[in-house]
């Protein structure tokens, strides 16, 4: 039975040209996280973090995506086109797959509130 829950940074906004941390956290389960896949709204892969093999960064983003912190992802040099949904897919054993959703809004304005549901360490 899948008992875990995914907490995410929820709906966030950030300034054009700035950076943002995409972060998910799996709780309420003892399942082992074997891999986390990060995908965009069109289901194209941004990055993979495998517990043993390390990071895979999709080549189109290699200059704009930094691995971490932790299982999260830092998206840099934001453009208006980065606005949209982002999904973290946690592959776990023995539970199976958990999925979280983050909505990122990139703002033209010089003041962009970056609100998160939980504090990123």
């Amino acid at each position: 039975m899948m008992t875990g829950t995914i907490e995410t940074t929820g709906n966030i906004s950030a300034k054009k040209g700035g950076s943002v941390i995409l972060q998910c956290h799996l709780s309420s389960t003892m399942a082992q996280v074997t891999q986390v896949n990060w995908e965009q709204h069109d289901h194209s892969l941004l990055a993979i973090r495998n517990a043993e093999l390390g990071w895979h960064i999709y080549p189109a983003f290699k200059d704009r995506v930094a691995p971490g912190p932790g299982l999260g992802l830092t998206l840099q040099s934001l453009t208006m086109n980065d606005t949209g949904e982002y999904f973290c897919t946690y592959h776990t054993y023995p539970d199976g797959t958990y999925r979280g959703r983050i909505f990122l809004e990139v703002l033209e304005s010089s003041v962009a509130e970056h609100s998160a549901r939980f504090q990123i360490p």
């Epitope: 896949n37 043993e52 895979h56 999709y58 592959h91």
Partner: antibody
Framework: EVQLQQSGPELVKPGASVKISCKTS????????IHWVKQSHGKSLEWIGG????????IYNQIFRGKATLTVDKSSSTAYMELRSLTSEDSAVYFC????????????WGQGTSVTVSS | DIVMTQSHKFMSTSIGDRVSITCKAS??????VVWYQQKPGQSPKLLIY???YRFTGVPDRFTGSGSGTDFTFTISSVQAEDLAVYYC?????????FGGGTKLEIK
Amino acid sequence: EVQLQQSGPELVKPGASVKISCKTSGYTFTEHVIHWVKQSHGKSLEWIGGFNPNHDGTIYNQIFRGKATLTVDKSSSTAYMELRSLTSEDSAVYFCTRAAKLLFAMDYWGQGTSVTVSS
Amino acid sequence: DIVMTQSHKFMSTSIGDRVSITCKASQHVSNAVVWYQQKPGQSPKLLIYSPSYRFTGVPDRFTGSGSGTDFTFTISSVQAEDLAVYYCQQHYSTPWTFGGGTKLEIK
């Protein structure tokens, strides 16, 4: 120049074990994962697993758990794969490969080691 | 495990022809697909990754495309040295899996 030099062909008896080596050169050994791939005669490729020398992490394809053991010797930049309890099904060419940095693609391959299991 | 299916085990072509090899994943693999070339008696070589980026030194007649479950590897103008078996492979989830291979034969 990146190179992966594998040990020579092996002829072994059923039930025995064999240890294949893969000596790497031309890059920083700890910065790249080493993978192992099996190719049975005239067949496709099967991923056995990978070893991450950066933090000694090992991952196996479930079907090779208990069959293959992956290790490395960082001092000589050499990766090893031991195969145990060999049967005719294990007769194949085994390749060591290097994964690209921050990319799950196997960019350089060893020449392959032929293992023949026969009594 | 994700199954990668290359529907054609053999493809026959002529020098200068355009040829496309297809690969279908049993489930969504996004853009996490790689193509390798294996010439007779040699080790596989990385050609294309992610799934449209050419590896260093790979001629531009080789291209890749696709996303999700359907992928295509194309040689725009086949040369004699392209005689080989071509494999797709997914790394979206472990265990990494390969297609059965497509052997390109020259008429």
